[in-house]
């Protein structure tokens, strides 16, 4: 029971990381700026990786998106990679899951194959987490470390003189948002694998049962399948003297017609 | 590269009218606002009036109800029209722009033009 409570409580907290990794990736608010030096009105600049966007006082919003652009920084694409890798590998780690869940059955699937395939989800939910975090955490770095800003303050180009407008860079929702999912990512996968020993059949280890008679000698008995269970000549539950015989997990366990005393 | 380029200037009498128009062009991202500044001779350069992309305008009190600001951003340009000029209107306008280029899309950066001379005679 605490097993598939495990293994359920997992799937979940996956399936609420992949979806949030996703809504993260999606989200323009990865960087925000405000632009202080508007003299017309108080203008928002916010991005993502897909696309920037200006919001003004008035309400409107324009958004441009990146695609069309070929000379992205690296960095950038970085980040996206890390993000999607984790999306994949999230998506394939619950369709795994779905089958490995102990509350489903699916034909005649062996518990063993439960146990693997629960622990190769976990895995892929630990790898998507981590890129998540990864990811966010390497375009946290880019802001920080104002990675974006052009050295160059003020120069003269060829229309006359540019200058680099002084904007503060602030973490936007999204990475807060992929942090956290990430994070949950991660511990659905942890329970995923911790569910996966609990599944996992331990090898049956029958002992050898002694019998001990009334008198003076003593029979070894090898245990077989029909000493272990019970299962024998004895159909018809006779009374049948066992001689105080028992297993080592203390269940009773019946001679059959093979064994001599 | 990107250039502002300013045209429309001159020579005008007292009352008269003059358009100006300003041409953002070359490696664009996004534009953000567009607008005017002036520089008279011996002076400090002084905020016009300016447009942002979803059309919010302000004038400096000076040239309230005088000049209208307005902008094609299809085409990326501004301009301004400039009635019932007077001799103090007399300076070099500056087209302006915050903007972010195609090899910085996380980057804004404040673009002037070289100006374009306008002249009221009294």
């Known amino acids: 029971m605490a097993v598939t409570a495990c293994q359920g409580l997992g799937f979940v907290v996956s399936l609420i990381g992949i979806a949030g990794i996703i809504a993260a990736t999606c989200m323009d608010q990865w960087s925000t700026q405000d632009l202080y030096n508007n003299p017309v009105t108080a203008v928002f600049n916010y991005q993502g990786l897909w696309r920037s966007c200006v919001r003004e006082s008035s309400g409107f919003t324009e958004c441009r998106g990146y695609f069309t652009l070929l000379g992205l920084p690296a960095m950038l694409q970085a980040v996206r990679a890390l993000m999607i890798v984790g999306i994949v590998l999230g998506a394939i780690g619950l369709l795994v899951s779905i089958f490995a869940l102990k509350c489903i059955r699916i034909g005649s699937m062996e518990d063993s194959a439960k146990a693997n395939m629960t622990l190769t989800s976990g895995i892929m939910f630990i790898v998507s987490g981590l890129c998540a975090i990864a990811g966010v955490s390497v375009f946290a770095n880019m802001l920080v470390t104002n990675f974006w800003m052009s050295t160059a303050n003020m120069y003269t180009g060829m229309g006359g003189m540019v200058q680099t407008v002084q904007t503060r860079y602030t973490f936007g929702a999204a990475l807060f948002v992929g942090w956290v999912a990430g994070g949950l990512t991660l511990i659905g996968g942890v329970m995923m694998c911790i569910a996966c020993r609990g599944l996992a059949p331990e090898e049956t280890n029958y002992k050898a049962v002694s019998y001990h008679a009334s008198g003076h000698s003593v029979a070894y008995k090898p245990g077989g399948f029909k000493a272990s269970t019970g299962f024998g000549s004895n159909t018809k539950n006779k009374k049948i003297y066992d001689g105080g015989a028992r297993t080592e997990d203390e269940v009773q366990s019946y001679p059959s017609k093979h064994d001599y005393v | 590269a990107v250039q502002l380029v300013e045209s429309g200037g001159g020579l005008v009498q007292a009352g008269g009218s003059l358009r100006l128009s300003c041409v953002a062009s070359?490696?664009?991202?996004?534009?953000?606002?567009m607008g005017w500044y002036r520089q008279a001779p011996g002076k400090q350069r002084e905020w016009v009036t300016g447009?942002?992309?979803?059309?919010?305008?302000r004038y400096a009190d000076s040239v309230k109800g005088r000049f209208t600001i307005s902008r094609d951003n299809a085409k990326n340009t501004v301009y301004l029209q400039m009635n019932s000029l007077k001799p103090e209107d007399t300076a070099v306008y500056y087209c302006?722009?915050?903007?972010?280029?195609?090899?910085?899309?996380?980057?804004?950066?404040?673009?002037w033009g070289q100006g374009t001379q306008v002249t009221v005679s009294a």
């Open positions: 447009i942002t992309t979803g059309g919010t305008t």
């Open positions: 302006n722009s915050d903007l972010k280029t195609t090899s910085n899309v996380f980057q804004w950066y404040e673009y």
């Open positions: 070359g490696s664009i991202f996004q534009i953000n606002t």
